[in-house]
């Protein structure tokens, strides 16, 4: 469950984040799983660990393999796995499927293409963008922060988009490229006040102390591609990241689905090793878009183990 797939190209920088997260003060140890050999933290090494990040500067095909990260706190250890694959650079223009990040779809109103994984790197604007290997030129294309905006999107804009940027580490520069497909939705969409499908308002979820629990916040926002729609969890009215409980994590990235033609998002809240104090918290599922915000609150209750009488 706490394993993450990462990939990159040889001679490019690759930075991987430990799938298990903790407070910045916690130490994170990295190991190469096949040999159980510790990854050094000294930056003079080509491959080194830097807290939650594992850095390949630059990556080599031989770096491929499974890396283990252990987040250590005074009270617990958490283990995650990063499955890293480094590929040889392709001589031709085609980007193979295994190098592609998730497909994004756009419409006339919303045509943002985010550069995948860029937030892990120390980069400076502007980004370079390519479509099907051709550098993008013309006033319709605007590189803005970490994404590309295409004005007046047309069906012909569908294709594979590659962002290229430079990662800087202690004065040394490394190239990074990432590619994802962009599809154009030619449909007349509409947007509604958010509708939360799950959880039900004031739902009580039964959990077992010491076990893991998942809460899913799922909401729909209208039809077609939605602009500025989001679902998120809060604990007692506090953002998950600010709450400071590493056992409780929001799943990275929102899953988008189209249910009966409706655009829906869901966000999973994972609670590891449920404790008594978790039963005292209010878990707020928030769904918001330009129309407004809707909140459903969940509380946890202890599931009584079934007595087995002889």
């Amino acid at each position: 469950k706490f394993s993450k797939q990462s990939w990159g190209l040889e001679n490019e920088a690759l930075i991987v984040r430990c799938p298990r997260q903790g407070k910045p003060s916690y130490t994170v140890d990295w190991y190469y799983s096949q040999t159980n050999k510790s990854i050094p933290t000294q930056e003079r090494n080509r491959v080194f660990a830097s807290g939650q990040l594992l850095k390949f500067l630059p990556a080599a095909v031989a770096d491929s393999g499974i890396y283990t990260c252990i987040v250590r706190s005074p009270t617990f250890n958490r283990t995650g796995y990063a499955n890293v694959t480094i590929y040889k650079k392709q001589s031709d223009c085609n980007v193979p499927d295994y190098l592609m990040y998730s497909t994004v779809s756009g419409s006339e109103k919303n045509s943002k293409i985010y550069c995948p994984t860029i937030d892990l790197y120390n980069w400076t604007a502007p980004l370079e963008w390519f479509k099907n290997c051709q550098a993008l030129q013309g006033s319709r294309y605007r590189a803005h922060k970490s994404f590309l905006v295409i004005d007046n999107v047309m069906t012909e804009d569908a294709g594979d988009y590659t962002c290229k940027f430079i990662h800087n580490e202690n004065g040394a520069n490394y190239s990074v490229t990432a590619t994802r497909s962009f599809t154009v939705k030619d449909e007349q969409g509409f947007s509604l006040f958010p509708v939360i499908g799950a959880p039900a308002q004031n739902e009580i979820k039964e959990v077992e102390i010491g076990k893991n629990a998942n809460l899913t916040c799922s909401a729909c926002f209208g039809k077609g591609t939605q602009f500025l729609a989001a679902v998120l969890w809060q604990l007692n009215g506090t953002k998950i990241t600010d709450f400071g409980e590493p056992r409780i994590q929001q799943e990275e990235g929102q899953n988008q689905s189209f249910s009966n033609g409706l655009a829906c998002l869901d966000m999973v809240l994972r609670i590891a090793d449920v404790k008594e104090e978790d039963l005292l918290l209010q878990y707020d599922c928030l769904a918001l878009n330009l129309h407004g915000l809707r909140r459903h609150t969940v509380r946890l209750s202890r599931k009584n183990p079934i007595d087995h009488h002889s």
Epitope: K239, D284, L288, G292, L293, R295
Partner: nanobody, 119 residues
Framework: ESGGGSVQAGGSLRLSCAAS????????MGWFRQAPGKEREGVAA????????FYDASVRGRFTISQDNAKNTVYLQMNSLKPEDTATYYC?????????????????WGQGTQVTVSS
């Protein structure tokens, strides 16, 4: 509410609303306005836990709603004011299960402050 007054078109005003008597955290705070002979209309709203903001199309880009959690206070910064912004402005609060510029989501209302914009 406070901060109302008279101003020339193109000018700015900042309205304040200090909240008390209910749970400010996890609430929805909003600004509404009513011009003489017209219906009350929503202007802006903010969800106090996280500061998510919502605006009516007529003021988006000109008005900004913000908050100071330490003071349980919400502000409405009004720039590029127009004569049609003239109205009594009301601060309102709701429980937070919904947050938008819709009056039915609010159950606490202030007394109102007058804003007059002359051309």
């Amino acid at each position: 509410e406070s901060g109302g007054g008279s101003v020339q078109a193109g000018g700015s005003l900042r309205l304040s609303c200090a909240a008390s008597g209910f749970t400010y955290r996890r609430a929805c705070m909003g600004w509404f306005r009513q011009a003489p002979g017209k219906e009350r209309e929503g202007v802006a709203a903010i969800y106090t836990s996280g500061g998510m903001t919502f605006y009516d199309a007529s003021v988006r880009g000109r008005f900004t709603i913000s908050q100071d959690n330490a003071k349980n206070t919400v502000y409405l910064q009004m720039n590029s004011l127009k004569p049609e912004d003239t109205a009594t402005y009301y601060c309102a609060a709701g429980g937070g299960d919904y947050c938008a510029t819709n009056a039915r989501f609010f159950n606490y209302w202030g007394q109102g402050t007058q804003v007059t914009v002359s051309s």
